[in-house]
């Protein structure tokens, strides 16, 4: 039921013109000498959206992005000329495209750019308090950006900065061939994935990186990387892409002899997002485009939302799959992928697995292995030759929660908001596309939580011209969505309740968890407000029961809650 016909037609379809006229979009149309507004950093406390672009870093006011400050950070003429002489495009490549923008500490951001094929990093001062109104480049302190930002602006970096250390998945060379997951900055020696070993990484494209605690002991914290890569030979006939989740222990300092300054706890598993097809052949959505982690109550167990597209040029489609961290951990505790030679098939490893199990974080509570440098040789050699798990991670309910195959666009980005409604909590997805539209979709549980119905609430065009949405952030505080593309940035509210019409029935039929009928208009629903005066039914969208002649008061007394 994940492609239910009536639910796949948006309740509201708003053109860019309609969005503007109804004051539902604010746009920053970019600067003449900049582009590629792709790197977002949301700071709810300061009420700022920091954006890395071509030769610029911006600080936008979350209330209204028309209010912004900018830092100009171009490359020197010499660098630009060197880049041009190397045969690169002066406009599209020989500039400083910002790829990393992270909070470094209370007063500074850390930023890295391509530097015209010569990656460079620096610190940006933002001050202690929002009212300081400081936003300036630390001109005296530039660092080599190799292993932090790619050389090529077409490539992405997945990065995470925690405790003064930068984890980044990127290409570390001019040619864009040496892809690796790095840890740099901090006081320790830089660490990376094994070089020139396709079993570890096989021409990957990194999507994002996230710290997810494993237990209440911080020694067990892991960093997870999401990426797509070429399937390893013998894993698939012909050239294929696989979506991956990779794990690394935060306290991995490399091996003592083998894997020196290399990860010893790196493991990866395939993420499956597929639908059963005719003749028993599944249709796979393998091109991972974006990931969003929905943290709710338990930081150890976020729900992972992934946006995928098909690899095929003939059949174009997009899907959203959800994954649970318990399923991910189960796969990482399962069999390792193993093969005896280049011409053999991959099989589950059935030999003796050394102790401590490769991929386990060293901790005093776990066998007394204080550091990865303390691991015996057999653990390191096994880890080196068995980076991949045999079993894949299947999505919750073993299928996508949403697919789109009958449209002229593909999904590119996703953010999710958890909304309290009258009849329970709902996850509302905002999905960006490659034509500059945003889909607003609500997941509605049916008989069980795992069985979800997707209702497409809105389809909004947020840019004047069709353009690929390359970044999205959601501010729960401001109840706004921020969208990045090559052309510029758009800001829109998460809800447009008044657009659903002037009648209770229309408001109810919308099934928008943000909205409820208050007796006179369709407006924002707040769970703290008196329930007696609100009409809303997300689960069933039934106006007959909820908007009866008996009035809202009478209806509410007999309403059954679904939790």
């Amino acid at each position: 039921n994940y492609q239910n016909g009536k639910n796949n037609v948006p309740r509201l379809k708003l053109s860019y013109k309609e969005m503007l006229e109804s004051n539902n979009v604010i746009t920053f149309n970019g600067l003449a000498n900049s582009s590629s507004y792709h790197t977002f950093l949301l700071d709810e406390e300061r009420s700022r959206l920091y954006v890395g672009a071509k030769d610029h870093i911006f600080s936008f006011n979350l209330v209204n992005i028309k209010d912004f400050q900018k830092i100009v950070w171009p490359v020197s003429y010499t660098r630009r000329d060197e880049c041009k002489w190397a045969g690169k495009d002066i406009l599209k490549e020989c500039a400083n495209f910002i790829k990393v923008l992270k909070a470094y500490n209370q007063t500074h951001l850390y930023a890295c750019g391509t530097g015209a094929f010569h990656p460079i990093c620096t610190y940006i001062e933002i001050g202690h308090h929002p009212e300081d109104n400081i936003f300036k480049l630390e001109n005296s302190h530039f660092e080599n950006g190799r292993g932090k930002s790619p050389y090529d602006p077409k490539l992405l970096t997945a990065s995470l900065l925690i405790d003064g250390e930068l984890y980044s998945g990127t290409a570390a060379d001019f040619m864009g061939r040496d892809f690796a997951i790095f840890r740099t900055l901090g006081h320790h020696h830089p660490i990376r994935t094994e070089q020139h070993d396709s079993r570890w990484l096989n021409d990957p494209r990194f999507i994002s990186a996230h710290l997810i605690p494993e237990s209440d002991n911080p020694e067990d914290d892991k960093v997870y990387f999401f990426f797509r890569e070429n399937a390893i030979d013998g894993e698939h006939s012909g050239k294929a892409t696989h979506a991956r989740i990779g794990q690394i222990c935060k306290n991995d300092f490399g091996g003592h002899r083998s894997l020196v300054n290399k990860w010893t706890t790196f493991l990866k598993a395939r993420l499956i997002c597929s639908v059963p097809g005719p003749n028993g052949i599944d249709t796979h959505f393998d091109e991972l485009q974006d990931v969003f982690l929905m943290n709710f109550k338990d930081p150890k167990n976020p729900i992972v939302y992934g946006v995928f597209t098909t690899s095929s040029n003939i059949f174009k489609g997009s899907a959203v799959c959800m994954y649970s961290m318990s399923d991910v951990r189960r796969v990482f505790l399962g069999p390792y992928a193993h093969r005896d030679g280049p011409n053999y098939q991959w099989v589950p490893y059935q030999g003796r697995v050394p102790y401590p199990r490769p991929g386990t974080c060293p901790s005093k509570t776990f066998g007394g292995f204080d550091s990865t440098k303390d691991l015996p040789d057999d653990v390191i050699t096994f880890a080196r030759s068995h980076p991949a798990m045999y079993n894949p991670v299947f999505p919750i309910n073993n299928r996508p929660i949403m697919i789109k195959t009958d449209v002229n666009y593909q999904f590119t980005q996703i953010v999710v908001d958890r909304v309290d409604a009258e009849d329970g909590q709902y996850d509302v997805m905002f999905i960006g596309t490659d034509v500059g539209t945003v889909l607003k979709v609500v997941s509605i549980p049916k008989e069980t939580w795992h069985d979800l119905e997707e209702v497409l609430l809105e389809e909004m065009t947020v840019f004047r011209e069709p353009t690929t949405i390359s970044a999205m952030e959601l501010s729960t505080k401001q109840q706004q969505l921020y969208i990045g593309s090559t052309a510029g940035i758009a800001q829109l509210p998460l809800h447009r309740c008044d657009i659903y019409g002037k009648a209770c029935a229309e408001c109810c039929l919308a099934r928008d968890p943000y909205c409820a009928w208050d007796g006179s208009s369709c407006s924002r629903y707040f769970p703290t407000a008196k329930a007696r005066t609100r009409a809303q039914d997300i689960r069933n969208g039934d106006p007959l029961t909820h908007c009866s002649d008996g009035g809202i008061e009478g209806r509410m007394d007999h309403h059954h809650h679904h939790h």
Epitope: G367, G368, D374, L375, P376, D377, T381
Partner: antibody
Framework: EVQLVESGGGLVQLGGSLRLSCAAS????????MSWVRQAPGKGLEWVST????????YYPDSVKDRFTISRDNSKNTLYLQMNSLRAEDTAVYYC??????????WGQGTTVTVSS | EIVLTQSPATLSLSPGERATLSCRAS??????LHWYQQKPGQAPRLLIY???QSISGIPARFSGSGSGTDFTLTISSLEPEDFAVYYC?????????FGGGTKLEIK
């Protein structure tokens, strides 16, 4: 200079117990894996056990598993081997060895254990 | 477990000659192989670690080579004090195992 001095060897009855000790000096004891290796009369070398730096985990071959226990006291720079349910085939010279994470680079002079029936 | 087979069991040579001792593993062990020398009534001492890495204090005439399953300890020119028993040991996986030894004797 690295020094490893074993003690506690001797004659023991079949099925009996014995505890070997090894006093280490000349290096940072807590920074290294430590091992015991034995050599039966006129025979080759046989690895008996290895303990990690913190003492939190140890490795054994099947031949001694569940009978021998290696332990260490990093505050005293001392390594131990508790041997229970001794068998005739446990008769050997027992060497205390520095290392076991990689190569075993320093060996004590050994202590003799004789199991008699 | 990984079985190490040393050959020959006994090697009879004269001082000044070149000695080549072999150690074969039952499965590939990379370069996780160490060589030890033991003289009668003495404890073993480490000669070569990780197949080919030399140790300070060990004469340069001792060298090691090989990886995977076949390893060699070479003594370029035998000195009288080199006549002893030589053991190889794998550190690739637990349980650690030693070869049966090669006795190098004076011809």
């Amino acid at each position: 200079e690295v020094q490893l001095v074993e003690s506690g060897g001797g004659l023991v009855q079949l099925g009996g117990s014995l505890r070997l000790s090894c006093a280490a000096s000349g290096f940072t004891f807590s920074s290294y894996y430590m091992s015991w290796v034995r050599q039966a009369p006129g025979k080759g070398l046989e690895w008996v056990s290895t303990i990690i730096k913190s003492g939190g985990y140890a490795y054994y071959p099947d031949s001694v598993k569940d009978r021998f226990t290696i332990s260490r006291d990093n505050s005293k720079n001392t390594l131990y081997l508790q041997m229970n349910s001794l068998r005739a085939e446990d008769t050997a010279v027992y060497y205390c060895v520095k290392g076991g994470q990689g190569a075993m680079d320093y060996w004590g002079q050994g202590t003799t254990v004789t199991v008699s029936s | 477990e990984i079985v190490l087979t040393q050959s020959p069991a006994t090697l009879s040579l004269s001082p000044g000659e070149r000695a080549t001792l072999s150690c074969r593993a039952s499965q590939s062990i990379g370069d996780y192989l160490h060589w030890y020398q033991q003289k009668p009534g003495q404890a073993p001492r480490l000669l070569i670690y990780y197949a080919s890495q030399s140790i300070s204090g060990i004469p340069a005439r001792f060298s090691g080579s090989g990886s995977g399953t076949d390893f060699t300890l070479t003594i370029s020119s035998l000195e009288p004090e080199d006549f002893a028993v030589y053991y190889c040991q794998q550190g690739y996986s637990f349980p650690y195992t030693f070869g049966g030894g090669t006795k190098l004797e004076i011809k």
